[in-house]
Structure formats: structure tokens, C-alpha cells
Amino acid sequence: NWVNVISDLKKIEDLIQSMHIDATLYTESDVHPSCKVTAMKCFLLELQVISLESGDASIHDTVENLIILANNSLSSNGNVTESGCKECEELEEKNIKEFLQSFVHIVQMFINTS
């Protein structure tokens, strides 16, 4: 359920507020609907960087849960093959705040277009 993913993103944003994490993360800020699964997989990979950088057990657990929820939601969409989409490394690097903002945006796209 994508709304549960949103809920975990809110938890992560609440948890990182008191931390100073300098990491920049590959961020897709203008997702084409035909590349949304590819983009989501990039977001999930980059999310693990936040987990590692924070060194925080609560963030680690929430990230782990979010990844499971998101992968379950992706698999329920069937095996979608997307072509002509950007590789994660081709995406713009952004700070954590902008990364999370764009992450919420793409999850919302999955909700809105379901």
C-alpha cells in the first residue's frame, strides 16, 4: 500500500530533523509516468544511503520497512518493463530535504495514477 510508504517517509522526515546529514542523493525530480518504476527503484537504492549515513536504528528500521512495502506495491503492479529511462547515476544530486520531497512526489504519482 503506497499510503503506508508515505507514512514511513513522514517518519523518516521526523527522525532526520535533529541530524546533520551532508549526503547528496541521486534524485529524479521530473518523473515521466512511463519511467516511474525505474525512478522508484533509484529512490529506494538512495534511501539506503540515508540509513547508513544516519547510523540511527529507528531510521534503519523505518527505511527497511519502507523498502519492503514499496517492493510489495511494485510487484503487485506486475512485471513492468520500462525502456529509455535514466540510470540512477544520470540523475541530479540533491540534498536530503529535496530528495525526500521528490520521493513523496513520486509515491503520490503511484497513488494518483493507480
Partner: antibody, heavy 119, light 108 residues
């Protein structure tokens, strides 16, 4: 600075169709944002009508869904609202608004246009 | 329920602090945004996300959330803060945007 401007008839007859257009300037309707219509009956609160993404995806308020159509015209950088089978209860100020990226918000609003439903 | 509930009215003495609240189960999943609306004018976004202010919004406005409640706090209220305030979020399905009923703030 993004600006939004609503236009359309200020008076619609009962059982007719309300049609409004929102012209977007200072930004592209083909940005990552969703675009919404919101209304406010005189002396009452705000009610979300529906939203559109430039690829044509739409979502509508369930209470209005059977009567609402929102469309986008990328060549004119505008989006439109049609509300059918109107009654006096649809009399309101109608606003177009741009949704922010990420968490729910409307970061830019039109100035609003009053539409009265009356014979 | 997908509704967002606000108290219809609130008041604050000039220069004092007031907190306006918004309740709804969906706020466990989503942050709320807050709008100020003065008579005859379009709403203006004052707070969005965790506690973000658009440029031009004074820092006396702040937002917070806990459980199913979001709050807008005005610290050192000014006469020009007298207005209607609305909260906004998505419903529990995530598909639909919803508004609270609004709170009319009077500055005494």
C-alpha cells in the same frame, strides 16, 4: 513568479454546464506539478474539486466526480474545468491552484472568479 | 473518516501566541499545509510539509504535528494576522485532497 488567472461566465443557468479556464503564466503547465480546482461557496469553507497532471491523469472529489471534467491544453499553457447539471448549491468562488511538490499544498492560487447559478 | 476538523473560531491578544489545530486520521500519514485567507482574497500558503514557510511568510508562523493532529502556531500575533485559517492534506486513500472547515482568528 507563477501566476494563475481564471476566466469564464459569471452566470450559469440551473441544469447547465459551468465552464472555466485557468491560464498559467510565469511557468509551464508541463512542470512536475499537479494543477487543481478549488471552490468556496459564499461565507463557507474551501472545497477541493479535482486535479490534473499534464500527461492527462486526473483525480476528482468523489462527491462531484459524476459531474466534473478537468482537461489540460499544453499548447495554450492552461487547464479547464467543466461542471455539469449545476444547481444553486454550485454557486461559489472558483479558484485554480498549483500543487506544490511533495507533501500536500497549494503554493500558487488564482484570484478566484465568482460563478452564480441562477435562472 | 477523511475529514479534517478545525475549531470554528479562535482569538488572541495582540502580541500573544495562539495555536490553531487540525485533526484527522490521515494526518498520521501526511503532513498538513496551512492557508491564511482574508475577506475577498484568495488563500495564501503559510506553512507546508514538516514546518516550511514559503518566502515572504513571517517567521512568527510555524507548524508542527503529532499523531492525528497538526498545529499552526502564531507567536506574537499582529493585527494583520486576523483572518480565516484552513488546513489541507490528503484523505486516507491518498487520492483526494481535503480541507478543514476553517478557523476564524480574531486579534484582540
Amino acid at each position: 513568479q507563477v501566476q494563475l488567472q481564471e476566466s469564464g461566465p459569471g452566470l450559469v443557468k440551473p441544469s447547465g454546464t459551468l465552464s472555466l479556464t485557468c491560464a498559467v503564466s510565469g511557468g509551464s503547465i508541463s512542470s512536475s506539478n499537479w494543477w487543481s480546482w478549488v471552490r468556496q461557496p459564499p461565507g463557507k469553507g474551501l472545497e477541493w474539486i479535482g486535479e490534473i497532471y499534464h500527461y492527462g491523469y486526473t483525480n476528482y472529489n468523489p462527491s462531484l466526480k459524476s459531474r466534473v471534467t478537468i482537461s489540460v491544453d499544453k499548447s495554450k499553457n492552461q487547464f479547464s474545468l467543466k461542471l455539469s447539471s449545476v444547481t444553486a448549491a454550485d454557486t461559489a468562488v472558483y479558484y485554480c491552484a498549483r500543487e506544490g511538490i511533495g507533501w500536500p499544498s497549494f503554493d500558487y492560487w488564482g484570484q478566484g472568479t465568482l460563478v452564480t447559478v441562477s435562472s | 473518516s477523511s475529514e479534517l476538523t478545525q475549531d470554528p473560531a479562535a482569538s488572541v491578544a495582540l502580541g500573544q501566541t495562539v495555536r490553531i489545530t487540525c485533526q484527522g486520521d490521515t494526518l498520521r500519514n501526511y503532513y498538513a499545509s496551512w492557508y491564511q485567507q482574508k475577506p475577498g482574497q484568495a488563500p495564501i500558503l503559510v506553512i507546508y510539509g514538516k514546518n516550511n514557510r514559503p518566502s515572504g511568510i513571517p517567521d512568527r508562523f510555524s507548524g508542527s504535528s503529532s499523531g492525528n493532529t497538526a498545529s499552526l502556531t502564531i507567536t506574537g500575533a499582529q493585527a494583520e494576522d486576523e483572518a480565516d485559517y484552513y488546513c489541507n492534506s490528503r484523505d486516507e486513500s491518498g487520492k483526494n485532497l481535503v480541507f478543514g472547515g476553517g478557523t476564524k482568528l480574531t486579534v484582540l
